[in-house]
């Protein structure tokens, strides 16, 4: 007689990443009886919510429900109905909401309140909506990539099942770039972490990890651009800003009120004799790079060494996974290959930024102009941040791996967050019981 397939004993989880520029919903799945095994949870769906980040709904909170509908309905379709009630839903908001909270705690709470009200209308088990800290964002990103790379597994393998696997248990560092903040997280080599705020201690699967992390608020790619514009307009002689970070022939009108809307530009704020100014692109990588460097204060460091703005950074150690906007931008620029040296990346950026705007628009006709116009700045910013901000060198550049997905799951903080909140990362190594692992043939 033929064996009848038993119903799949699986569980699901949903995490919404409420970022500064957009919200994404992730659905994860895992075998119910293997919850404590490492590497069993994987992503089955990503749904990008149409529209901006939730912090932009502050004056129209009643629209949040409609905004979330499509992706929540998608989750309803993907997850079997019998599992709906059991499926936890978490929403974590990042730096966009941190910035809103800095301006008004009441407004930030109003947004989260409406988020809860909207998500409570679905049949899932809603667990909470909150603003995660920068430290958590860094830590959970680090957990995600190392979980997916199999770094927490005690089983050594003679074959490689994941990309970038160096077949050792050395963890990867995590480099995360968002729209409003950027995180750097790694295990330093025998180095004391000189500032307690940047130190994390984990015990995962029976092993202790001393992890360094820092989140630079206002140094995500979008807020960094606002900072740069606010800094440069201070010294402009009129309402024309000739900007090396935009392609030659590019023109855009910016409202001064929009420029000063974010707390990230407060330090550059001044009374200007005009309400609007026009960006005129001149497309010069070197000048753009120089302008970006002025955002990093490297003159002050109260520690043995710093990244910038007086923030402690230990010597870099090991390999790093660079994900989120680090990956999206470099992927667009076709610079994610392991074979491309830092010098080659710089060369390519020089050429790209110098290309006339009309030419760029023709070459990338399918790309929204808003995004297309900013790749020169974003690519240059990534190089500046990694080289001057975090002190990567031409030699250590090869230790940076630009990662979008690992084993089909997106690199980012959401998986680590869910693993932690559902208690799926044990402190101790689970005892191997018979039949608890698949048999290798």
């Amino acid at each position: 007689t033929q064996n009848k397939a038993l119903p799949e004993n699986v569980k699901y989880g949903i995490v919404l990443d409420a970022g500064s520029s957009h919200t994404s919903l992730y659905i994860y799945k895992w075998p119910a009886e293997k919850e404590n095994d490492t590497g069993v949870v994987h992503q089955v769906e990503e749904c990008r919510v149409k529209g901006p980040g939730i912090s932009k709904f502050v004056q129209k909170v009643n629209e949040i429900g409609i905004y979330l509908t499509d992706c929540m309905e998608r989750a309803r379709e993907v997850i079997p109905r019998s599992q709906h009630q059991e499926t936890p839903v978490y929403l974590g908001a990042t730096a966009g909401m941190r910035l809103l909270r800095m301006e008004s705690e009441e407004l930030a709470d109003r947004v989260l309140d409406v988020v809860e009200r909207s998500l409570s209308n679905y049949p899932f088990d809603f667990q909470g909506a909150r603003i995660i800290t920068g430290q958590e964002e860094g830590a959970y990103g680090w957990i995600t990539i190392n979980y997916l790379l199999g770094k927490f597994s005690q089983k050594t393998r003679w074959f490689s099942i994941v990309p970038y696997e160096t077949n050792n248990q050395e963890t990867f560092g995590a480099l995360d770039l968002g729209g409003a903040s950027t995180q750097v997280t790694f295990v330093p080599q025998n180095q004391t972490i000189e500032s307690p705020d940047n130190a994390l201690q984990f015990r995962l699967y029976g092993k202790d990890y001393n992890v360094y992390t820092h989140s630079f608020l206002c140094y995500g790619k979008d807020q960094a651009l606002w900072q740069k514009l606010a800094k440069d307009i201070q010294v402009a002689s009129n309402e024309i800003l000739r900007d090396p970070c935009f392609h030659p022939g590019y023109k855009k009108v910016v409202n001064v009120s929009d420029l000063y809307k974010t707390p990230c530009t407060k330090r550059f704020e001044m009374t200007l004799p005009f309400q609007q100014f026009e960006i005129q692109g001149i497309g010069n990588y070197q000048q753009c790079h120089q302008s970006i460097l002025e955002l990093f204060n490297t003159s002050y460091c109260p520690y043995s060494q710093c990244a910038f703005n007086g923030i402690f950074l230990p010597p870099l150690q090991g390999d790093f996974g660079a994900f989120s906007a680090f990956y999206f931008v470099m992927k667009f620029l076709n610079l994610t290959s392991e074979k491309v040296s830092q010098e080659k990346v710089t060369e390519m950026m020089k050429k790209f930024c110098a290309q006339p705007w009309e030419e760029i628009k023709t070459s990338y006709a399918g790309v929204k102009e808003k995004y297309l116009s900013e790749y020169c700045f974003s690519g240059t910013y990534i190089l500046s941040l990694l080289l001057q901000g975090y002190h990567f060198t031409a030699d250590s550049w090869e230790h940076i791996h630009f990662i979008g997905k690992i084993q089909g799951s997106d690199a980012g903080w959401t998986l680590g967050y869910m693993l932690n909140l559902t208690n799926m990362i044990p402190a101790e190594q689970p005892l191997s019981t018979p039949l608890s692992h698949s048999t290798y043939v």
């Epitope: 978490y90 709470d109 309140d113 809860e116 009200r117 409570s120 809603f126 909470g128 909506a129 909150r130």
Partner: nanobody
Framework: EVQLLESGGGLVQPGGSLRLSCAVS????????MSWFRQAPGQERDFVTA????????HYADSVKGRFTISRDNSKNTVYLQMNSLRAEDTAVYYC???????????????????WGQGTQVTVSS
Amino acid sequence: EVQLLESGGGLVQPGGSLRLSCAVSRGTFSEYSMSWFRQAPGQERDFVTAISGFGHITHYADSVKGRFTISRDNSKNTVYLQMNSLRAEDTAVYYCAAAWQTSPRRMMQMAGSITWGQGTQVTVSS
């Protein structure tokens, strides 16, 4: 970790009303689902009601539905239990409980990591 302090307990006649309060210190209050449990002498601790971080999800034990109402004021970091039409069988020590990023449904099942208050005595007697 959050700290919880209940108040408002006391002696009340059958059919009467009482409002319990639970003040929460430390932590970000809206990140916690809040709950009330009760324990009668010689009995297990039983679930009464729970409420989500911003108050849009509530669950009640069948025995108190329509009589008890849970609410919260996030500006005051306080959760309330309004108890009406009290009965002798409602006599118990009432405990406030908090669970971080945990649904009211899971609190009802006593799942997740729960922080407890010291309890306040409610006696319903004529």
